[in-house]
């Protein structure tokens, strides 16, 4: 085919941006290109071409008419992580190709299983009490808070310190007795540990 005067090579006019998305949620990596003839767009992750519904109708990834890559749901397991990585879109026509900036897609996860559940504690009034938990693995790293008898623990109480997975009460009162739960939270949601009972005995 002859080169037509009005034809021009592709250029990327909208680059994809870095994303952090919860597992199972939809996501879009944007890409828009100009060129004449209209360029075709393909996506690559880590140097491998990304399969979309154009290759397999059952794919959870769709190439939109705009050139954007749409994920019906982000797929991410313990060992298989097909969607996580660094993506580029490539626009091509007969005059050449244009490559977008890199865009990283990170997957936010929060597993179900606490690595350590808090244990029951029994102390005398006035003694210190310590409960410890390790939240489920997560990305971003989950923050830890505590509930007592179903309500968020008042960490403004100067006797109470929450550091890492440790809940420390420097000197216990009878009113501290109750059922405690460790809560791990990130952008995915929250997970509650098994219940641990704090028993405060009269001296």
């Amino acid at each position: 085919s002859r080169l037509r005067q009005e034809d021009f090579p592709p250029r990327i006019v909208e680059h994809p941006s870095d994303l952090i998305v919860s597992k199972g949620e939809p996501a879009t990596l944007n890409c828009k290109a100009e060129g004449r003839p209209t360029p075709t767009i393909e996506w690559y992750k880590g140097g491998e071409r990304v399969e979309t519904d154009k290759d397999d109708p059952r794919s959870h990834r769709m190439l939109l008419p705009s050139g954007s890559l749409f994920f019906l749901r982000i797929v991410h397991g313990r060992r298989s992580k097909p969607d996580e990585g660094v993506y580029v879109c490539v626009a091509r026509n007969y005059l050449g190709e244009a490559v977008s900036h890199n865009a990283s897609l990170e997957v936010a996860i929060l597993r179900d299983d606490f690595r350590q559940n808090p244990s029951d504690v029994m102390v005398a009034v006035g003694e210190p009490a310590v409960m410890e938990c390790q939240p489920p693995r997560g990305h971003p790293e989950p923050t830890i808070s505590w509930k007592k008898d179903g309500s968020p623990l008042d960490d403004k109480d100067e006797r109470i310190t929450i550091r890492g997975g440790k809940l420390m009460i420097t000197y216990t009162r009878k009113s501290d007795a109750g059922k405690y739960v460790c809560v791990g939270t990130n952008m995915v949601g929250e997970r509650e540990s098994e219940v641990a009972e704090l028993t405060v005995l009269e001296r």
Epitope: V75, H76, G77, R78, R79, P82, D112
Partner: antibody, heavy 118, light 105 residues
Framework: EVQLVQSGAEVKKPGASVKVSCKAS????????MHWVRQAPGQGLEWMGW????????KFPQKFQGRVTMTRDTSITTAYMDLSRLRSDDTAVYYC???????????WGQGTMVTVSS | DIVMTQSPSSLSASVGDRVTITCRAS??????LNWYQQKPGKAPKLLIY???SLQYGVPSRFSGSGSGTDFTLTISSLQPEDFATYYC???????FGGGTKVEIK
């Protein structure tokens, strides 16, 4: 079409090694963990370990450590399982299986029969 | 290692029967449990993942339930093609249960 195609049946002598291949097609090879599972005649399924095709890192249950090697060649989207110091009780059908993002083995190879006999 | 115990190891049933197979984990595994079907001379086939999610293309007569340590695979109305061996697998440590063979009565 997503599929795993394994190498053909093997007959080996005790003490020898066997290398089984598993050619993946129809999906992004580097994105999915690859596992090996075996099944002795008339017995159940026994998980042998897995390889991360992206990094080449492997993990095996204690039973197979030191005797099994798992490798991959990303340029030809093929995983390999090498079992050494073969014994008669290694006679089994060996399967490769892809692990989905839902932590389950959703695609299996057709199996490779390995017979260990003197 | 987490040990998976399936019961029964075999059962006889008729077409149309409701069949239940159980799998017990030696420690809590949340919902990290899968079920597979295997026919003689064939590779296993995934039926259920994450304890209760039906794999694409699997008939709705198959269902899974349970969490923690006790899990169940149910076939609501047994069909001739369902006579096979069924395996549970925990997806944390990846070990399989011993299998349940479903035979024709």
């Amino acid at each position: 079409e997503v599929q795993l195609v394994q190498s053909g049946a093997e007959v080996k002598k005790p003490g020898a090694s066997v290398k089984v291949s598993c050619k993946a097609s129809g999906y992004t090879f580097r994105g999915y963990a690859m596992h090996w599972v075996r099944q002795a005649p008339g017995q159940g399924l026994e998980w042998m370990g897995w390889i991360d095709p992206r990094t080449g890192l492997t993990k095996f249950p204690q039973k197979f450590q030191g005797r099994v090697t798992m490798t991959r060649d990303t340029s030809i989207t093929t995983a390999y399982m090498d079992l050494s110091r073969l014994r008669s009780d290694d006679t089994a059908v060996y399967y490769c299986a892809r692990e989905s993002g839902d932590d389950a083995f959703d695609i299996w190879g057709q199996g490779t029969m390995v017979t260990v006999s003197s | 290692d987490i040990v998976m115990t399936q019961s029964p190891s075999s059962l006889s049933a008729s077409v149309g029967d409701r069949v239940t197979i159980t799998c017990r984990a030696s420690q809590k595994i949340s919902s990290y449990l899968n079920w597979y079907q295997q026919k003689p001379g064939k590779a296993p086939k995934l039926l259920i993942y994450a304890a209760s999610s039906l794999q694409y293309g699997v008939p709705s007569r198959f269902s899974g339930s349970g969490s923690g340590t006790d899990f169940t695979l149910t076939i609501s109305s047994l069909q001739p093609e369902d006579f096979a061996t069924y395996y549970c697998q925990q997806s944390v440590g990846l070990f399989f249960g011993g299998g349940t063979k479903v035979e024709i009565k």
